[in-house]
Amino acid sequence: IIPVEEENPDFWNRQAAEALGAAKKLQPIQTAAKNLIIFLGDGMGVSTVTAARILKGQKEEKLGPETPLAMDHFPYVALSKTYSVDKHVPDSAATATAYLCGVKGNFQTIGLSAAARYNQCNTTRGNEVVSVMNRAKKAGKSVGVVTTTRVQHASPAGAYAHTVNRNWYSDANMPGSARREGCKDIATQLISNMDIDVILGGGRKYMFRMGAPDPEYPHDYSQDGTRMDGKNLVQEWLAKHQGARYVWNRTELMQASLDPSVTHLMGLFEPGDMKYEIHRDPTLDPSLMEMTEAALRLLSRNPRGFFLFVEGGRIDHGHHESRAYRALTEAVMFDDAIERAGQLTSEEDTLTLVTADHSHVFSFGAYPLRGSSIFGLAPGKAQDRKAYTALLYGNGPGYVLKDGARPDVTESESGSPEYRQQAAVPLDEETHAGEDVAVFARGPQAHLVHGVQEQSFVAHVMAFAACLEPYTACDLAPPAGTTD
Amino acid sequence: IIPVEEENPDFWNRQAAEALGAAKKLQPIQTAAKNLIIFLGDGMGVSTVTAARILKGQKEEKLGPETPLAMDHFPYVALSKTYSVDKHVPDSAATATAYLCGVKGNFQTIGLSAAARYNQCNTTRGNEVVSVMNRAKKAGKSVGVVTTTRVQHASPAGAYAHTVNRNWYSDANMPGSARREGCKDIATQLISNMDIDVILGGGRKYMFRMGAPDPEYPHDYSQDGTRMDGKNLVQEWLAKHQGARYVWNRTELMQASLDPSVTHLMGLFEPGDMKYEIHRDPTLDPSLMEMTEAALRLLSRNPRGFFLFVEGGRIDHGHHESRAYRALTEAVMFDDAIERAGQLTSEEDTLTLVTADHSHVFSFGAYPLRGSSIFGLAPGKAQDRKAYTALLYGNGPGYVLKDGARPDVTESESGSPEYRQQAAVPLDEETHAGEDVAVFARGPQAHLVHGVQEQSFVAHVMAFAACLEPYTACDLAPPAGTTD
């Protein structure tokens, strides 16, 4: 499809002149930020951003790539170098330490400097690094964590936990030696390391004693509580604050978010990760957009401002499965949440960042016609005279041989949410990729997000913009609309 | 390898504080640009940038990813949407029209709006769009084109040509009907469409009559001239200017670039594309860095300034071959040329952009240890119990089956310049990829390069910064150091 209006040079010249006009008008917001929001698209490399843009555009009945995402409207962009201290290609634990604490760490460790060693409990003490969320709380702001994964997962844990092993979700996931040496599971750290006002996501089973039935799946033993210490961490958390409320479904979340007596809110909507958006039951589970809105309602009440972490955490999972349909529908939902947050906040007082922790070996190639489905086949056939998809992976479970040859694929197969795009190398799980990811920024001090930076720079921009440690002497005018 | 200094949080905190300090000090250069330089890494998507950074760092005996490329030092970054009017994933012709002329076109067409149709000569007339280089020449600036491909190749041709078929290098590549309808081959357009002061790259055979022996390969008939019209285009070009000089080897280039009587310089160093850097004979052929330096010497003499296009054109070719070694060594050489240009120009009066026309389905994954060779194997084995490389392709000639199975690979194989990384789908040629590419900017008006933009915006930024058509009423103070 060639859109007639795009055949005219005036279309492009006018559009560019408008973009130039906007660029010339762009003025840095030089005040401090009252509020900080970081949107983290887990595994959302640039190829995922572009493919999600096309999908979102096509969902809106456009051709695709011309239609801006919410994040595309952010005025400032930088590239972030994601390597961990010990690996060229990182994981979500080491990267969370970087963008949330401002210090790079080692693969699979969270909230610890690189002096800590994976799985060695005795290297924890003394190597803790403090998250920007923690510093925001100390400065009197309200703070929240929202994710589509378990709230104890690597990315959100970077905001509150310190652990040499990202897999220590509950004490049942830890070796006895680590427990004896005094290391704490992530769920325990969630409720005890710091005061978090809003906690929304999955991860019920790590909060309750082993065998405790799940409220949503009472007859499914695999969803029972897992804790060996017999504790009810939700109960312990509720006891800390008079205005604390725990919810486990969408209806309760909506009620709680509108209740002025609720000061602290924990919503855990699945035993483990939340369901993919395409599998979500909207009568039971909230969307990422709804969780973001609920969090913003509560956090916005604090006159001193807030810090909010929002993760589209299952973009990554879709890619690991070699299922681009899942990754991209998650990415579109993530962008919807960004859009909603933009409507509920002001760029005058809120610094909003959108970024990824790392990328994936996911590519969008061949030469598909404009307007063709993002999940479609490439024009023409491969050398083996079989069809192939425009979306492909470098490695992963999409690698299959059928009778010693690459399998053919039809349009109708390639569109299925279950379809695994093919890969060059067979792995149980498709891997992350090591290329730089984008950081999109809007609001006070967003102009500092520029050029090519270490991923750890992201945390420092947030800390500086809100005059948090170690930048309390930030020398910035107070946020718009404040009087202190 | 875990670098000891990186184990200390102070290392990262200090580094980030310095980066913040630099970001806060960053002041837009609000004057007009006297000079414009666009560095075009053909096929240099973000994954190529990161992998090249690691390779360049390792060449410098560092671990790799921490070591900035020359382009990493540019203060402003944007993302560029590369789709063509008719394709989600574009080619180098349609994209050249976008970033050099400011208007998006159709796949395989150059210097024409999307009203033109591929290969249909009669859709050319009236649909021509004018490059920024052409506008710079009209404004009295000197202009130059430097590439490692043929100078008649798609990317450089975007600066001077208008053609419905990028493959019409000489009249021998055109159907008789197109010649009869008055369409001109690209080599003819190179010498006749406009006055170009410096032309450096490959492409000798398209300039001379069929059967004319090549000076470097006189006994290789496949390198003979190709022109059916019997013309000697070099002779015709030399006749246009008293100070014109033609050179075909490195020694002559060095002499000519230092000769003040030379006002126009054409250097064609190979019959077709120039050799890959790893195959270059430095006694015969100049490097991209040397060609860039020679061009800058000549062009800098003009008190009104210059426009220079420099292409690392064979990054793309390495990827098409599924040979990452070639693509990445070309990218490192490209970065060396950027570095040299930075030493020879001032950011006070020169707007320098670095970008790509499109990406490739090239990924850098697995979880390789820090400091491991960029060409190395992934840690561990694949599901088929064979080794695999960190670098892989989505599609391309790297796909091979050996006895109905994926072949194994050793470290020594994977490090060979000839090695083709494996791919998910077998194609003669690995394809481009459709994700956004980075635009790096430094100099006057570089701050306008921000956010996510259409690729066509790039040309408009250059035109505006230098107050060229259609932005002659740019309302900018004159460039630094000028008196008019």
Epitope: Q58, T329, G376, G415, S416, P417 | -
Partner: nanobody, 121 residues
Framework: QVHLVESGGGLVQAGGSLRLSCAAS????????MGWFRQAPGKEREFVAA???????EYADSVKGRFTISRDNAKDTVYLQMNSLKPEDTAVYYC???????????????WGQGTQVTVSS
Amino acid sequence: QVHLVESGGGLVQAGGSLRLSCAASRRSFSEYAMGWFRQAPGKEREFVAAIGWSGVIEYADSVKGRFTISRDNAKDTVYLQMNSLKPEDTAVYYCAAGLGIRVVSQTPAYWGQGTQVTVSS
């Protein structure tokens, strides 16, 4: 998941009419573009018509002017009104759902089981 159930197929004389229905079991039916495909014996499945959530519509050239697609979001149902039927319209008709009209017309995510339409001459 989206479950699609077609109905309304049957035997009809050439020149006659049929109305196919497709009921979707899913909350965000209105987010999806809906389409109809058909597969004649021994042939590939081919696109017939699609309708986006915004009401934008596309038809295959072979059915333009004869078939009309419509949707009722309140009932989570999409319809295909088939007039001036020809023997070559004989096929199994499948309902499909996808994220946008371009996706549904090429690579639908969800398919119904199909309903047989036979046009006798």
